[in-house]
């Protein structure tokens, strides 16, 4: 056998080159035939109606042929013939690579709730070899559970994610990545999460600066809550009692001039939207006027509330004072 | 000057042998495909037989068994060894060099198959 | 075995055009060859393959194909072109050769 011809992958579109090679020429007939042992070129003429086969190079050691925008229908076995006495013959492989249609991608919800379990979907259709769906949430890879469909030798690839997501996932992108032969670089399509989540309150005193309350000094606590949608209402309370007559509410904020022993207690920001209800308090303990004698000691207090707490603590040990909690989280 | 010159037709009798020849000048017939064709008086132009470069022979439906096909490489020389002959061979025999295309044919050979 | 279909003639005047058409199964997948025979003379290859013709053919004669059907067509027939063509191609994948029933064009 001195007839030889190399297999080849070509993705489809573009241009596959098939040859057909003689170690020791003897003027014998080359001949290349197609799938269906037409013949495409006899020597140097093309008697088969396709006019992509077209001619590189014909001598009597080569017969070298080009197949322009190959398609899938061109897949298979081409055989090089040479008459020689008796005749040989060789094949090469032709294979196809189809990179995938089209990606895309698909969030069973626009919005989804912190907590709640959602289904993406990522069909790669129309491809050949099957590809490879790869799963990213912002930088990290997740794990889908793929479905391959086979129709005339091309797959179409559908994988599916459950991801429970997290109001930290608000606006993170959730990337379907594909990896083919036939596709060089990165290919992906992705959409942002849009996570929806209660509040998250927090109490800032923002006079006294020094943190301490003394009688006859004034107070005023900002109310800050962040939530997805913006919470719509922002209300001061004051636990198991009323609210100072002396105290002003505007909107997030909270003033009492003048304060005395009577308005100790445990003052609460509640906020709220469409997915829930949250809370944070503030302890106020109102301080004698500073004495010139300071006692040596100071003490900390500490409280336990019913729901997970972030916990701002806000002491000072300055001679003659006691310092306190002064805000829980809810 | 490429030329191909056919001899050996002539008067036989049915049943009968005839050799025909072709030779060739200007090209080698071993490295060509040859092919011999025919034309019945008055008719149009039938194919007959095939010889390929590597020695592949082929031939129609109405010769097969009967008609043989050869070369002589020494010789540079066709033939067509014909047996069992029959009215219906009545013809002028043509050899040509090629298949998908025959372009160089000789003038021809007249063979009459008759009693 | 298949065959290819040719109409019998065809005149044409002078210096005018005309087409001679051959139809066939392998003509779906195989280009054809095309001959002009004078009476009392050899054929001669004037056109085969997609686009080719010997060398000393006028380029009056010229070929085209589409589905089953392939045609040789003569821009300005002249008096010489009075003839008998005849198409040929293989017959499918098998390893014999067909000839169409010839068209005889006659030049008026």
């Known amino acids: 056998q001195n007839l030889f011809t190399k297999d080849v992958t070509v993705i489809e579109g573009e241009v596959a080159t098939i040859s057909c090679q003689v170690n020791k020429s003897d003027d014998s007939v080359i001949q290349l035939l197609n799938p269906n042992r037409q013949t495409i070129y006899f020597r140097d003429f093309r008697p088969l109606k396709d006019s992509r086969f077209q001619l590189l190079n014909f001598s009597s050691s080569e017969l070298k042929v080009s197949l322009t925008n190959v398609s899938i229908s061109d897949e298979g076995r081409y055989f090089c013939q040479l008459y020689t006495d008796p005749p040989q013959e060789s094949y090469t492989t032709i294979t196809v690579l189809v990179p995938p249609r089209n990606l895309m991608i698909d969030i069973q919800k626009d919005t989804a709730v912190e907590g709640e379990e959602i289904e993406v979907n990522c069909t790669a259709m129309a491809s050949k070899p099957a590809t490879t769906i790869r799963w990213f949430k912002g930088n990290t890879e997740l794990k889908g559970k793929s479905e391959v469909e086979e129709w005339s030798d091309m797959y179409t690839v559908t994988s599916q994610l459950m991801l429970k997501v997290h109001k930290e996932d608000d606006g993170v992108p959730v990337i379907c990545q594909v990896e083919h032969p036939a596709v060089t670089g990165n290919l992906q399509t992705q959409r942002y999460l849009e996570v929806q989540y209660k509040p998250q309150v927090h109490i800032q005193m923002t006079y006294p600066l020094q943190g301490l309350t003394r009688e006859g000094d004034a107070l005023e606590l900002t109310c800050e809550a962040i939530g997805k949608p913006q919470p719509v209402m922002v209300t001061w309370v004051r636990v198991d009692d009323e609210m100072p007559q002396h105290a002003v509410l505007s909107g997030p904020n909270l003033f009492i001039n003048n304060l005395n022993k009577t308005d100790n207690g445990t003052y609460r920001c509640e906020a709220s939207n469409i997915v829930g209800k949250a809370h944070s308090d503030y302890m106020l303990y109102v301080y004698d006027p500073p004495t010139t004698i300071p006692p040596p000691t100071t003490t900390t207090t500490t409280t336990t509330t019913t729901t997970t707490t972030i916990l701002t603590i806000i002491t000072d040990s300055r001679a003659g004072e006691e310092g306190s909690i002064r805000a829980v989280d809810h | 000057e490429v030329q191909l010159v056919e001899s050996g037709g002539g008067l036989i009798q049915p049943g009968g042998s005839l050799r025909l020849s072709c030779a060739a000048s200007?090209?080698?017939?071993?490295?060509?495909?040859m092919s011999w064709v025919r034309q019945a008086p008055g008719k149009g132009l039938e194919w007959v037989s095939v010889i390929y470069s590597g020695g592949s022979t082929y031939y129609a439906d109405s010769v097969k068994g009967r008609f043989t096909i050869s070369r002589d490489n020494s010789k540079n020389t066709l033939y067509l060894q014909m047996n069992s002959l029959r009215a219906e061979d009545t013809a002028v025999y043509y050899c040509?060099?090629?298949?998908?295309?025959?372009?160089?044919w000789g003038k021809g050979t007249t063979v009459t198959v008759s009693s | 075995s298949s065959e290819l279909t040719q109409d019998p003639a065809v005149s044409v005047a002078s210096g005018q055009t005309v087409r001679i058409t051959c139809q066939g199964d392998s003509l779906r997948h195989y280009y054809p060859s095309w001959y002009q025979q004078k009476p009392r003379q050899a054929p001669v290859l004037v056109f085969f393959g997609e686009n080719n013709r010997p060398s000393g053919i006028p380029d009056r004669f010229s070929g085209s194909a589409s589905g089953n059907t392939a045609s040789l067509t003569i821009a300005g027939a002249q008096a010489e072109d009075d003839a008998d063509y005849y198409c040929?191609?293989?017959?499918?994948?098998?390893?014999?050769?067909?000839f169409g029933g010839g068209t005889k064009v006659t030049v008026l």
């Open positions: 200007g090209f080698t017939v071993s490295s060509n495909y």
């Open positions: 040509a060099r090629g298949t998908w295309y025959m372009d160089v």
């Open positions: 040929s191609s293989r017959d499918g994948n098998d390893d014999r050769w067909l």
